[in-house]
């Protein structure tokens, strides 16, 4: 029993939460809260928006983003792409892992109507030590942040 | 090998399913089937809609609700909120854990059109012994129950 | 530590990805890539679209499908059903495990408008040795495949 408990305590896991600073507008990935509130890191590291593996293996990675807007203003993409991407030193360009495309603006029948939508991604991927996973949303201007419960990013080893 | 197997058999996990009695209309959380069909409890308890932790640790908790309606009748919220909330003896009010907002009615272009939508939430949270997690949906009148496969609630220790 | 590591390496897990051959049009389940790209099988088998359990226990199973189209052509269902189903030798018919219904076409306000939507399912189910899980989508003509990152199917023992 002691052994079983210890194994759980050591199993890499993390849950990062959205904050006002998540949206940089710089074209980079979303940034995350790692310590306050519901956020934590256990056996994984964090660096500039990325969860970093300290132990090689298969991880269930997940992310949810809360989307919202008023109508569909011109200049905003009618398609929103939410994805989890891997960074690895050998391949400097990010590799797609899990991706969703949605057209939530279409729900609003007039330009003045408020709409909300949510996108959830989750799946098992392999990470080597030092490999990183980030979240991107295009167009990130439609991501609605509040208190860390509506947009988040996490992982655990399976 | 025996030890590995035992560790799996003892790992807290649960999957609860929606039933006709899930929607109380009382303003309380959704209630769930815990034993019949696909529902089970292993190392977690259930009490008045809540999954109750028997062992402290990090849990991946999840819920899906099936939403549906005919048009968007007046009096129904155009925004639906689906959330997982924690109850802990130290705080009298429920704490938001994972929340989604959606505007599914906007999909129906006329008041007579049938629409369906689904909301999925999942993420890792920490639970102490005796802490509870519940599911709430506002407006719960739009939750469509059938056979326990469309609306459900579960957790497992990671 | 050796034991904990071994237990992770042996823990059944799989992630299968969508490919052009996934959609058969035959009324059968979706088929999947099992080896290349992000796809892998560890302690689970694959057979004609199905993940097959080699070890009895509780599994978190999940699937995401990317949906998309242009308007809502006549003859296409306005409701899309995405589900995970169990095949077991004891019962000739597939058993529903986790199911979602969505009406994504309603998002397109004209017949020429492109729309995208995504459906995610995940939950814990019990599988005996030899039992199979498959993914079905009705109407599968609306499933959009690309690169294995947008539509996928996986599982791991919890």
């Amino acid at each position: 029993l002691i052994q079983e408990r210890r194994s759980h305590q050591n199993n890499p896991a993390a849950h990062l939460t959205g904050a006002n600073s998540s949206l940089t507008g710089s074209g980079g990935p979303l940034l995350w809260e790692t310590q306050l509130g519901l956020a934590f890191l256990r056996g994984l590291d964090y660096h500039d928006g990325a969860l970093v593996a300290n132990k090689a293996g298969y991880y269930y990675i997940y992310s949810k983003v809360q989307l919202g807007g008023v109508g569909c203003p011109l200049g905003l993409a009618s398609t929103i792409t939410h994805g989890l991407y891997k960074r690895t030193p050998r391949y400097p360009e990010e590799l797609e892992l899990l991706v969703s495309q949605q057209s939530p603006c279409g729900r609003a029948t007039s330009n003045s109507r408020v709409w909300w939508d949510s996108s959830f991604l989750g799946g098992v991927v392999h990470l080597e030590v030092g490999e990183e996973v980030v979240v991107r949303v295009l167009d990130e201007r439609l991501v609605r942040l509040r208190d860390g419960t509506r947009s988040y990013f996490g992982a655990f080893m399976v | 090998l025996i030890q590995e197997r035992r560790s799996h058999q003892n790992n807290p996990a649960a999957h609860l399913t929606g039933a006709n009695s899930s929607l109380t209309g009382s303003g309380g959380p959704l209630l769930w089937e815990t034993q019949l069909g696909l529902a089970f409890l292993r190392g977690l308890d259930y009490h008045d809609g809540a999954l109750v932790a028997n062992k402290a640790g990090y849990y991946y908790i999840y819920s899906k609700v099936q939403l549906g309606g005919v048009g968007c009748p007046l009096g129904l919220a155009s925004t639906i909120t689906h959330g997982l909330y924690k109850r802990t003896p130290r705080y009298p009010e429920e704490l938001e854990l994972l929340v989604s907002q959606q505007s599914p009615c906007g999909r129906a272009t006329s008041n007579s059109r049938v629409w369906w939508d689904s909301s999925f939430l999942g993420g890792v949270v920490h639970l102490e012994v005796g802490e509870e997690v519940v599911v709430r949906v506002l407006d719960e009148r739009l939750v469509r129950l059938r056979d326990g496969t469309r609306s459900y609630f579960g957790a497992f220790m990671v | 530590l050796i034991q904990e590591r071994r237990s992770h390496q042996n823990n059944p897990a799989a992630h299968l990805t969508g490919a052009n051959s996934s959609l058969t049009g035959s009324g059968g389940p979706l088929l999947w890539e099992t080896q290349l790209g992000l796809a892998f099988l560890r302690g689970l088998d694959y057979h004609d679209g199905a993940l097959v359990a080699n070890k009895a226990g509780y599994y978190y199973i999940y699937s995401k499908v990317q949906l998309g189209g242009v308007g809502c052509p006549l003859g296409l269902a306005s409701t899309i059903t995405h589900g995970l189903y169990k095949r077991t030798p004891r019962y000739p018919e597939e058993l529903e495990l986790l199911v979602s219904q969505q009406s994504p076409c309603g998002r397109a306000t004209s017949n020429s408008r492109v729309w995208w939507d995504s459906s995610f399912l995940g939950g814990v189910v019990h599988l005996e040795v030899g039992e199979e899980v498959v993914v079905r989508v009705l109407d599968e003509r609306l499933v959009r495949l690309r690169d294995g990152t947008r539509s996928y199917f996986g599982a791991f023992m919890v």
């Epitope: 298969y58 590799l95 392999h126 080597e128 | - | 390496q9 490919a19 290349l36 560890r42 690309r146 690169d147």
Partner: antibody, heavy 117, light 110 residues
Framework: QVQLVQSGAEVKKPGASVKVSCKAS????????ISWVRQAPGQGLEWMGW????????NYAQKLQGRVTMTTDTSTSTAYMELRSLRSDDTAMYYC??????????WGQGTLVTVSS | QSALTQPASVSGSPGQSITISCTGT?????????VSWYQQHPGKAPKLMIY???KRPSGVSNRFSGSKSGNTASLTISGLQAEDEADYYC??????????FGGGTKLTVL
């Protein structure tokens, strides 16, 4: 860094078998497949098949089915390719390569197999 | 499934740009963004130059670029140099756990 080192050159008679090894280092061996590719003198690359190191699943090119067997030894992070009933047209450079997603990287240095009576 | 089609040879002078094509079908090249390119010098093992149609591994010169249009992928080498003289092979995912190689193209730097 990630590296694949293959066994040395072999000379075999027609009808014999050859077993080429490929030792991996610098990554988690059991998390990737190993593919085998051969190249006859002056010819292009020919994919022979691969093996998934974590579950030993194999996938062989149709023209080699029944003559080729790919195996792994996870304890030594080594992959093996055995080709039986050798013919003169099996004379080639045999390469192993890590199968990373949908490409081959890195490659072993190659093992020359000469089939001659 | 037959091999992808590449020209047997191409040539160019130092400083010029050349493009090598790789033609398949909608079931392989056209169906996925999973085309890779390999460079092979005489007597050496192949080396990955491009993956996922257009991405370069670390250490590969930015003179090498990849693209795709329909069922045809292309490798372009700009500012041609003497050391670029080699054989080049394309490879594409073709579904159902299958990868296909092209027949290879011999690049001569004049």
């Amino acid at each position: 860094q990630v590296q694949l080192v293959q066994s040395g050159a072999e000379v075999k008679k027609p009808g014999a078998s050859v077993k080429v090894s490929c030792k991996a280092s610098g990554y988690t061996f059991t998390s990737y497949g190993i593919s085998w590719v051969r190249q006859a003198p002056g010819q292009g690359l020919e994919w022979m098949g691969w093996i998934s190191a974590h579950n030993a699943n194999t996938n062989y090119a149709q023209k080699l089915q029944g003559r080729v067997t790919m195996t792994t030894d996870t304890s030594t992070s080594t992959a093996y390719m055995e080709l039986r009933s050798l013919r003169s047209d099996d004379t080639a450079m045999y390469y192993c390569a890590r199968l990373y997603r949908n490409w081959f990287d890195p490659w072993g240095q190659g093992t020359l197999v000469t089939v001659s009576s | 499934q037959s091999a992808l089609t590449q020209p047997a040879s191409v040539s160019g002078s130092p400083g010029q740009s050349i493009t090598i094509s790789c033609t398949g079908t909608s079931s392989d090249v056209g169906g996925y963004n999973y085309v890779s390119w390999y460079q092979q010098h005489p007597g050496k093992a192949p080396k990955l130059m491009i993956y996922d149609v257009s991405k370069r591994p670390s250490g590969v010169s930015n003179r090498f670029s990849g693209s795709k249009s329909g069922n045809t992928a292309s490798l372009t080498i700009s500012g041609l140099q003497a050391e670029d003289e080699a054989d080049y092979y394309c490879c594409s995912y073709a579904g159902s756990s299958t990868l296909l190689f092209g027949g290879g193209t011999k690049l001569t730097v004049l």
